[in-house]
């Protein structure tokens, strides 16, 4: 397990929420992606692969989520001061194999001007 | 030196058992990827297991459910257990180490970077 | 699962000529990161030369070098010295299987 800041913008602020970028290689095919807040599970998206290549994609903490095929996005809304965290992306990857998982994270900072519903 | 020393092989008879071993030295075994790789006499490399850093294991077609890898990270150590032999599983075997590394959205592949030098399996009547 | 064919069967050429060996996915491979080169010698393990399509391993002479993307490779030795004649393998890493190795190019002195 390699455990890492995330070398791009995680964090993309818009409408008093926050979407957090969770990428993972292009060449993965099947994989979990974990959203963590501190070490808390958030969010998760399963993607697997079956016969005939048809694709299936489960969630267990159940978050809106994006999926792009180099990248998982997820969606906090109604942010507030108790937001600000480490936020972490535990990527298990299935396919290819062997399994591994890679996990890569940053701080969430909490500014007024990104608040939900904040009086002008 | 980073080194791969096999041993086990040897003459069996078809249906029969062998316990290939493989003994790793210079680098930390347990931070690889290790597979086994076999070679028929005059003919090409045909990879035949898999065993990832955290124990899970995968195989060709051909060996499935006859042929088990495994790894003791203790002894630095690979194994092939081999049970009902064929004929066709006549070959030297390979131990090779899987230079690959995940680190966030990158993937690296470096290759099957250091191979022993093989030992040899004859299934004969 | 993907197939690697390797062209030619046997390649006949003179020390200080250029080779040229060819590689073919059966389809197109998502990322040339995956493929690799190895060359083998009579009574001897195989030996990393190319990986990532085109970049060479530690201690390979620069006269080696990998080339291709999508379903052709090459690797190509572009002033063959005695001891390059050997057979040489290209290699894939992917799903089902993990490893897939081409059947081999063999490179004699002619």
């Known amino acids: 397990e390699i455990n890492g800041s995330a070398n791009y913008e995680m964090f993309i602020f818009h409408n008093g929420g926050v979407q957090i970028l969770c990428k993972y290689p292009d060449i993965v095919q099947q994989f979990k992606m974990q959203l963590l807040k501190g070490g808390q599970i958030l969010c998760d998206l399963t993607k697997t692969k079956g016969s005939g290549n048809t694709v299936s994609i489960k969630s267990l903490k159940f978050c809106h989520s994006q999926l792009s095929n180099n990248s998982v996005s997820f969606f906090l809304y109604n942010l507030d001061h108790s937001h600000a965290n480490y936020y972490f992306c535990n990527l298990s990857i299935f396919d290819p194999p062997p399994f591994k998982v890679t996990l890569t994270g940053g701080y969430l900072h909490i500014y007024e001007s990104q608040l939900c519903c904040q009086l002008k | 030196e980073v080194q791969l020393v096999e041993s086990g092989g040897g003459l069996v008879q078809p249906g029969g058992s062998l316990r290939l071993s493989c003994a790793a030295s210079?680098?930390?075994?347990?931070?690889?990827?290790m597979h086994w790789v076999r070679q028929p006499t005059g003919k090409g490399l045909e990879w035949v297991a898999l065993?990832?850093?955290?124990?899970?294991?995968y195989y060709s077609d051909s060996v499935k459910g006859r042929l088990t890898i495994s790894r003791e990270n203790a002894k630095k150590s690979l194994y092939l257990q081999m049970n009902s032999l064929r004929v066709g599983d006549t070959a030297v075997y390979y131990c090779?180490?899987?230079?690959?590394?995940?680190?966030?959205?990158?993937?690296?592949?470096?290759?099957?970077?250091?191979w022993g030098q093989g030992t040899t399996v004859t299934v004969s009547s | 699962e993907i197939v690697l064919t390797q062209s030619p069967g046997t390649l006949s050429l003179s020390p200080g000529e250029r080779a040229t060996l060819s590689c073919r996915a059966s389809?197109?491979?998502?990322?040339?990161?995956?493929l690799a080169w190895y060359q083998q010698k009579p009574d001897q393990a195989p030996r990393l030369l190319i990986y990532?399509?085109?970049t060479r391993a530690t201690g390979i002479p620069d006269r080696f070098s990998g080339s291709g993307s999508g379903t052709d490779f090459t690797l190509t030795i572009s002033r063959l010295e005695p001891e390059d004649f050997a057979v040489y393998y290209c290699?894939?890493?992917?799903?089902?299987?993990?490893?897939?190795f081409g059947q081999g190019t063999r490179l004699e002195i002619k």
């Open positions: 389809q197109s491979v998502s990322t040339s990161r995956t």
């Open positions: 290699q894939l890493f992917g799903s089902s299987p993990p490893i897939t």
């Open positions: 990532g399509a085109s």
């Open positions: 065993i990832g850093t955290a124990g899970d294991t």
């Open positions: 090779v180490r899987d230079r690959r590394a995940v680190a966030g959205h990158y993937y690296y592949f470096y290759g099957l970077d250091v």
């Open positions: 210079g680098f930390t075994f347990n931070g690889y990827d």
